[in-house]
């Protein structure tokens, strides 16, 4: 039975040209995390494999930095980066847990962070 929950940074906003950290945390399970995939709608941004470390998709090599931890740092943000981001935890023996983050990239200098929330 899948007992874990994923806590994410929820709905967040950031300034155009700036950077943002996407973070998820898996709790309430003893399952072993074998890999975490970071995806943006229909694109893969990065993979963190428990044994090998990070893989960054070629399209994002100039703008994505691994970490902190299992998180992902997006740099040089554009308005096109606005949208849904998913952290997909591959675990054994539980299976797959998915967390969702919505990022809004703002033209203005006011960019507030939203509240944290959980996805079972």
């Amino acid at each position: 039975m899948m007992t874990g929950t994923i806590e994410t940074t929820g709905n967040i906003s950031a300034e155009k040209g700036g950077s943002i950290i996407l973070q998820c945390h898996l709790s309430s399970t003893t399952a072993q995390v074998t890999q975490v995939n970071w995806e943006q709608q229909d694109q893969l941004l990065a993979i963190c494999n428990a044994d090998l470390g990070w893989h960054i998709s070629p399209s994002f090599k100039d703008r994505v930095a691994p970490g902190p931890g299992l998180g992902l740092t997006l740099q040089s943000l554009t308005v096109n980066d606005t949208g849904e981001y998913f952290c997909i935890y591959h675990t054994y023996p539980d299976g797959t847990y998915t967390g969702r983050i919505f990022l809004e990239v703002l033209e203005s200098s006011v960019a507030e962070h939203g509240a944290r929330f959980q996805i079972p």
Epitope: D51, G53, H55, I56, S57, R63, P66, G67
Partner: antibody, heavy 127, light 106 residues
Framework: EVQLQESGPGLVKPSQSLSLTCSVT????????WGWIRKFPGNKMEWMGF???????SYNPSLKSRISITRDTSKNQFFLQLHSVTTDDTATYSC?????????????????????WGPGTMVTVSS | DIQMTQSPSLLSASVGDRVTLNCKAS??????LAWYQQKLGEAPKFLIY???SLQTGIPSRFSGSGSGTDFTLTISGLQPEDVATYFC????????FGGGTKVELK
């Protein structure tokens, strides 16, 4: 040009250990990621495991209890040991390089594909 | 495990033909796919990464396309030296390979 060459016995008895060596020229095994892949009769291929630039390892879960990959950086070689072999382990064994990339954060990241391979060595498990 | 299925298993074509090889993943792998060429008795040769990016030094008659679950390797004008077995490999979740497509001359 990066070149890899596998070597080791072509015949191993059931229940014994299979030991293979991959000798690398044109690249240091202290960089990039180095893997073993095998092709069974009938063409099915299986990734077996990696040793990384730092010496850490990653193994196919289906082989985890039987496999060991080590290296000797002074000889620029890495090694495969597969224990308790059966006739199902009869295959052509190849070593290969998976290249790495240095990220913005100066971390080494794996690329996922194998850009240089050895020609492979056929290993038969039979009594 | 993600399963990779290649079709056809055998393809016969003439020199100059446009040849299309298919690779299907059992679930979405985005574009994390590589293609290789292997001639009899030789080491595999790396052709394409990230589904459509040509490795340096590979002739431009080779091209890759696709994303998600369906991928294609195209040889735009088959040459005698292209006779080989071609296989795909995913690197989205672990590393798994297709069964290969053997290309021969008619």
């Amino acid at each position: 040009e990066v070149q890899l060459q596998e070597s080791g016995p072509g015949l191993v008895k059931p229940s014994q250990s299979l030991s293979l060596t991959c000798s690398v020229t044109g690249s240091s095994i202290a960089s990039d990621y180095w893997g073993w892949i095998r092709k069974f009769p009938g063409n099915k291929m299986e990734w077996m495991g990696f040793i990384t630039y730092s010496g850490s390892t990653s193994y196919n879960p289906s082989l985890k209890s039987r496999i060991s990959i080590t290296r000797d950086t002074s000889k620029n070689q890495f090694f495969l040991q597969l224990h308790s072999v059966t006739t199902d382990d009869t295959a052509t064994y190849s070593c290969a390089r998976m290249p790495s990339f240095i990220t913005l954060a100066s971390l080494s990241t794996w690329e996922g594909y194998f850009d240089f391979w050895g020609p492979g060595t056929m290993v038969t498990v039979s009594s | 495990d993600i399963q990779m299925t290649q079709s056809p298993s055998l393809l016969s074509a003439s020199v100059g033909d446009r040849v299309t090889l298919n690779c299907k993943a059992s679930q979405s792998i985005h574009k994390n796919l590589a293609w290789y060429q292997q001639k009899l008795g030789e080491a595999p040769k790396f052709l394409i990464y990230y589904a459509n990016s040509l490795q340096t030094g590979i002739p431009s008659r080779f091209s890759g396309s696709g994303s998600g679950t369906d991928f294609t390797l195209t040889i735009s004008g088959l040459q005698p030296e292209d006779v080989a077995t071609y296989f795909c490999q995913q690197y989205y979740s672990g590393w798994t390979f297709g069964g290969g497509t053997k290309v021969e001359l008619k």
